[in-house]
């Protein structure tokens, strides 16, 4: 059975539907069972903090990135680390906290409509989940200029949020990552916690917009940990 929460990344003011589902023989669908969806009860609470091992940034929360815990440390041992705030040093976009991106080695605000007018950007990109390339090093990829004539609209396939138009972020939608709207005040968000069981979120939501954070909805404080509803709220 699909032992997960079937919620989507579309922005809704209602809680995601709970419960499992399965594609049984003879039913009308062919299902992909057992995939970890966001918002489920498989995350540990922050009190049970454990360094979460990872292979890529995507396996970490929105406020985290995947890296070796020590500078020049064993590349084979990577964990989810807290994202870098504005003006902190970085090597790639994922290291910077939501709402920021990495420019010239420093996390800067993405409100400045970066990349507009820039025809090409050279990025460091690694292949696959194992971060390996044919020669064992990250390769430098120059993105073709056509990608930057127009920024991706909602639904456009992307690799990073900088591929998307203003007000959109790049979030997984199973087959690929696509541009989705950044969440507004009152909209349901996914509170990323350490994963208790390994699995990718295949239907991700964007992060909350500027000035908002993902917090437990006030009238849900009494609910059990697993069913607490998080919404984007003013700081």
């Amino acid at each position: 059975t699909l032992n997960s929460v079937l919620n989507s990344n579309a922005i809704k003011n209602l809680p995601p539907p709970l419960g499992g589902a399965a594609g049984h023989p003879g039913s009308a669908v062919s299902a992909a069972p057992g995939i970890l969806y966001p918002g489920g009860n498989k995350y540990q609470t922050i009190d049970n903090y454990q360094p979460y091992p990872c292979a890529e940034d995507e396996e970490c929360g929105t406020d985290e990135y995947c890296a070796s815990p020590t500078r020049g440390g064993d590349a084979g041992v990577q964990i989810c680390l807290a994202c870098r705030k504005r003006r902190k040093r970085c090597m790639r976009h994922a290291m910077c906290c939501p709402g920021n991106y990495c420019k010239n080695g420093i996390c800067v605000s993405s409100d400045q409509n970066h990349f507009r007018g820039e025809i090409e950007e050279t990025i460091t990109e690694s292949f696959g989940n194992d971060h390996s390339t044919l020669d064992g090093y990250s390769r430098r990829t120059t993105l073709s200029s056509k990608m930057y004539h127009t920024k991706g609209q909602e639904g456009s396939v992307c690799l990073r949020s900088s591929d998307c138009a203003s007000g959109l972020c790049c979030a997984r939608h199973f087959w690929s990552k696509i541009c989705k709207p950044v969440l507004k005040e009152g909209q349901v968000c996914t509170k990323h916690r350490r994963k208790g069981s390994h699995g990718l979120e295949i239907f991700q939501r964007c992060y909350c917009g500027e000035g908002l954070s993902c917090r437990i909805q006030k009238d849900h404080h009494q609910a059990s940990n697993s069913s607490r509803l998080h919404t984007c709220q003013r700081h």
Partner: antibody, heavy 112, light 111 residues
Framework: EVQLVQSGAEVKKPGASVKVSCKAS????????IHWVRQAPGQGLEWMGW????????TYAQKFQARVTMSRDTSSSTAYMELSRLESDDTAMYFC?????WGKGTMVTVSS | QAVLTQPSSVSGAPGQRVSISCTGS?????????VHWYQQLPGTAPRLLIY???NRPSGVPDRFSGSKSGTSASLVIAGLQAEDEADYYC???????????FGTGTKLTVL
């Protein structure tokens, strides 16, 4: 339980149009995209395009751009794929997919 | 010319290990787009075997594994069983076509 139930098999003449439906249930229809994929007898899978169930925005594979129209009716949680100017090599099984769930397929036969 | 190329057929005896390759280019697999693998039994819809390069849905035996490196991906089936006889397809996205693409498909025969 998530279900994608497709309409029944169709037999069409060359030059005609066919409209295949895909009724979704068990989830919030407007939260997901519906893709259409076809498979000619003995051949591989071929992506035709998608529709955003909420906005109705569509993206079509270039091959089908001039002949395909994808639409949806949110009130009945149903997606539609219409293919016009049918030719014999459009004979195929047409699947709708929510990416993680697939319909069972609709067989469309084009024959004079 | 197919975008994602797979061997048209592979075969193996029960218990053996087989590998199915999926070769793409710098505009699909090599551009860091994810690869998914499907199994299709005759007359049925495709069934997801591996998602996002190397993740296995529950219900899929751990005999199936996926990997991705450079411009290609592989599906490995260890300990072949008779019920594995089916067609297998890889899938990714291609930014030059602005389209999702499937591999040419591989027919697996269990001898």
């Amino acid at each position: 339980e998530v279900q994608l139930v497709q309409s029944g098999a169709e037999v069409k003449k060359p030059g005609a149009s066919v409209k295949v439906s895909c009724k979704a249930s068990g989830y919030t229809f407007t939260d997901y995209y519906i893709h259409w994929v076809r498979q000619a007898p003995g051949q591989g899978l071929e992506w035709m395009g998608w529709i955003h169930s909420n906005s109705g925005a569509t993206t079509y594979a270039q091959k089908f751009q001039a002949r395909v129209t994808m639409s949806r009716d949110t009130s009945s949680s149903t997606a539609y794929m219409e293919l016009s100017r049918l030719e014999s090599d459009d004979t195929a099984m047409y699947f709708c997919s929510r990416e993680d769930y697939w319909g069972k397929g609709t067989m469309v036969t084009v024959s004079s | 010319q197919a975008v994602l190329t797979q061997p048209s057929s592979v075969s193996g005896a029960p218990g053996q290990r087989v590998s199915i390759s999926c070769t793409g280019s710098s505009s699909n697999i090599g551009a860091a787009y994810d690869v998914h693998w499907y199994q299709q039994l005759p007359g049925t819809a495709p069934r997801l075997l591996i998602y996002v390069n190397n993740n296995r849905p529950s219900g899929v035996p751990d005999r199936f594994s996926g990997s991705k490196s450079g411009t290609s991906a592989s599906l490995v089936i260890a300990g072949l069983q008779a019920e594995d006889e089916a067609d297998y397809y890889c899938q990714s996205y291609d930014n030059s076509l602005n389209a999702y693409v499937f591999g040419t498909g591989t027919k697996l025969t269990v001898l």
